[in-house]
Amino acid sequence: SGVFQLQLQEFINERGVLASGRPCEPGCRTFFRVCLKHFQAVVSPGPCTFGTVSTPVLGTNSFAVRDDSSGGGRNPLQLPFNFTWPGTFSLIIEAWHAPGDDLRPEALPPDALISKIAIQGSLAVGQNWLLDEQTSTLTRLRYSYRVICSDNYYGDNCSRLCKKRNDHFGHYVCQPDGNLSCLPGWTGEYCQQPICLSGCHEQNGYCSKPAECLCRPGWQGRLCNECIPHNGCRHGTCSTPWQCTCDEGWGGLFCDQDLNYCTHHSPCKNGATCSNSGQRSYTCTCRPGYTGVDCELELSECDSNPCRNGGSCKDQEDGYHCLCPPGYYGLHCEHSTLSCADSPCFNGGSCRERNQGANYACECPPNFTGSNCEKKVDRCTSNPCANGGQCLNRGPSRMCRCRPGFTGTYCELHVSDCARNPCAHGGTCHDLENGLMCTCPAGFSGRRCEVRTSIDACASSPCFNRATCYTDLSTDTFVCNCPYGFVGSRCEFPVGLPPSFPW
C-alpha cells in the first residue's frame, strides 16, 4: 500500500489557447485531470488502473501552482494504491478549460482540452521527487512526482506491513525494509522475549522483563547459579538442588551429626589432647595435674602418690614434700638404707640384692606394686574409661561403668539406637542424632514398620478361567475361587469331563 504523489508546479499557456488553437474566452480557466496506470510501451487510452484524480481550477492561462491546498484541491495530488508497487507506471496529465463551474467530464465540450501529456517509465519507492517538464507547441507544464509507502508499509514495493509495537506480543519499531528492530532489552522473532540479566543461568534462570533473573525451583542467587540444598541441611552443600553433601566432620541425612566433636567444640580443658571416638563422642587425655572427663579438675600434687616406699605426702604451696619411713631417703623416698637382710619386701615379694648388697629390689606378686610391694595395684589410675565412664577396681581386674549411650570394655563405643534391631518386618534402620528412622519394605508402614499395609495380591490378575481372586491379608497372597470345571491354585487346569455312557 502506498501513494503516488504528483506535484504540479507551473503551467504556461501564454496565448491562452485550446489544443485546437482556438482561444479561450475570456482566458483559459485551467484545471487538470490525472490518470495513473500500469506501464504501457505506448501509452494509450483506457482504464486508469492505478487511479485518477482531478483538481479544481488552479489558474488562468499561465500560473504557478501553490503547494498544499488551492481552491479546495491538494498539491501534491495523491493517488493511493492498495497493492504491491510494480516499479513501473504510465501517467497521463490533461489540462482542461472550464467555461463554467461544472468540471465533470460529461459537462465539458470535447474541444475544451488545452493540452495532454503522457509519460511512462520506472519509478522506485523513495522520498526524492523526480522533476519533469513537458512542452508542446503552445504550452509547457513543470511538475514532479514520487511514490512513497502508506503509513505502516515498508520495503521496495510497499508490500511489508509493519506496525511498531510495545506490548506483550512484541517490543519493536520498523526498519525501512519492514523488518522488526527490537527495542533495547528484547529479542526473538517478534521481539517478545526479554533479554535476562547478563550472566543469568540459561537453564536455571528466566525472566519476564529485561535485565531480570528469576530462579527456577531449586536454584538461588543473583544469577540463579547456586543450588538450594535439602531443607534442613545444616553442615552440607549441594551441586544439584535438594542435595545435602556433608562438610568434613559432619554426617547424617541433614549433615547435622557431629563426627568431629573435638574440632567443632574443643571440649577438653587445660591443654588436654582430644580424640574423636564416634558420633558426638570424644576422649580427653589430660596433662599431668588434671583429671575429669574434660580434664577440667585440677589434681592435688599428692594425688599422684609421688612418695615411694611408704613415704607420706604433704601438700605445700610450691609443690609437695615426702616424709620417708625409716630406712628411706630422697625427694620421693626412693633411696633405701635397707638391704635384703632387713626383709623389706611385703606381701610375699621376693628380695634381690643389687650393687654388691648396697641396695635391693623387690619382685612383687600379682596385684601388688611399689618399691616394697606395699601397694595394692589400682588399675584405675590411668583413667582407662573413655567418654566419662567410671572405673571400678574388682580384685585383680578392673571394669568401666559406662554413661548412657556408650558401651565396650572402655566405654569407647557409641551405642547405636539401631543395635537392638527396632525396625520390624525387615525395615532398614538409620541412626539419627535424636533417635532413629525406619525405612519400611513394601507392605509395611509406621514408625517401626509395625503396621501391615494391605498389598493387593490380586492386582496382577493371577487367576485364570474367570476365577474370582481374593487377597489373604494375613499373608499378602491370593486365593483363586475356581468356577465349575476348573482346578489348580490358579484354576488353570480343566477338570476331565465324565465319560459318556452308551446306554
Epitope: 511498531k164 506490548d167 506483550h168 526473538g188 522473532e189 517478545q192 519476564s208
Partner: antibody, heavy 121, light 106 residues
Framework: EVQLQESGPGLVKPSETLSLTCTVS??????????WGWIRQPPGKGLEWIGD???????YYNPSLKSRVTISVDTSKNQFSLKLSSVTAADTAVYYC??????FGGGADSWGQGTLVTVSS | SYELTQPPSVSVSPGQTASITCSGD??????VSWYQQKPGQSPVLVIY???QRPSGIPERFSGSNSGDTATLTISGTQAMDEADYYC?????????FGSGTKVTVL
C-alpha cells in the same frame, strides 16, 4: 491440532470466587509463541477480554477486572486457570479459554467450546 | 479506556459484498483481528494483522485498516456467512473487542 477444554462449576454464589481451568491438549503450553487467554460473553451480549498469561507466568489483565482476577499456569499439567473473586450476577457468562498467537499479532487462533457460569444464590 | 465501534447489523444479498466497519482512535496504527461467531458456537479467527487469512478461511474474507477505521469485507456472500462478527485490537497490554455486528444474508 491443539485443543482447549474449559472445566469448573457451572453455578457460583454471589460474593464467592469463580474458578475455571483450561486444559490444553495436542500441543505444549510451554511455548514462547503463545499467550493463553480468558474471554467471556454474557448471554446475548458481546465478547469481553479478561486477561492472559504465558508459560513463565507473566500475566496481563483487563483494567476493569484487574482487582478481582487471577490467572495462573501449571506447565506440568498443561493447564491454565482463572479465578474471579467477589462475583455478582453481572459475571454470569459463557467463559472461553483461547490461545493467542504471537505470530498472528495476538489473534486468538484456537478457542475452547466455552462453559456457562451462572452467578446465583 | 480504548473503544472499538461496530454497526449493530449489516444485511446483504447472497452473492453480494458485505462490508463491516470497526472504528477506533488511530486504529490504523494497531493490528486488527476479526472473529466470526455463529449461534451456540465459539468464535473463529477469520482475519489477523488487518488483512491476513488463517489457513482454512475462504478467500472471500478480506480485511483492510487505515486511519481510524478497519473493514472486514465478505465478497460473494454465502448463506453460511450469516453470523456475528467481532473486531479486536490490543491497547496498552489489554485486548479490546468491538461491540459486534450481526450479518444477515437476505
Amino acid at each position: 491440532e491443539v485443543q482447549l477444554q474449559e472445566s469448573g462449576p457451572g453455578l457460583v454464589k454471589p460474593s464467592e470466587t469463580l474458578s475455571l481451568t483450561c486444559t490444553v491438549s495436542g500441543g505444549s503450553i510451554s511455548s514462547g509463541s503463545y499467550y493463553w487467554g480468558w474471554i467471556r460473553q454474557p448471554p446475548g451480549k458481546g465478547l469481553e477480554w479478561i486477561g492472559d498469561i504465558n508459560y513463565i507466568g507473566s500475566t496481563y489483565y483487563n483494567p476493569s477486572l484487574k482487582s478481582r482476577v487471577t490467572i495462573s499456569v501449571d506447565t506440568s499439567k498443561n493447564q491454565f486457570s482463572l479465578k474471579l473473586s467477589s462475583v455478582t450476577a453481572a459475571d454470569t457468562a459463557v467463559y472461553y479459554c483461547a490461545r493467542e498467537a504471537v505470530s498472528f499479532g495476538g489473534g486468538a487462533d484456537s478457542w475452547g467450546q466455552g462453559t456457562l457460569v451462572t452467578v446465583s444464590s | 479506556s480504548y473503544e472499538l465501534t461496530q454497526p449493530p447489523s449489516v444485511s446483504v444479498s447472497p452473492g453480494q459484498t458485505a462490508s463491516i466497519t470497526c472504528s477506533g482512535d488511530r486504529l490504523g496504527d494497531k493490528y486488527v483481528s476479526w472473529y466470526q461467531q455463529k449461534p451456540g458456537q465459539s468464535p473463529v479467527l477469520v482475519i489477523y494483522e488487518d488483512s491476513q487469512r488463517p489457513s482454512g478461511i475462504p478467500e472471500r474474507f478480506s480485511g483492510s485498516n487505515s486511519g481510524d477505521t478497519a473493514t472486514l469485507t465478505i465478497s460473494g456472500t454465502q448463506a453460511m456467512d450469516e453470523a456475528d462478527y467481532y473486531c479486536q485490537a490490543w491497547d496498552m497490554e489489554a485486548g479490546v473487542f468491538g461491540s459486534g455486528t450481526k450479518v444477515t444474508v437476505l
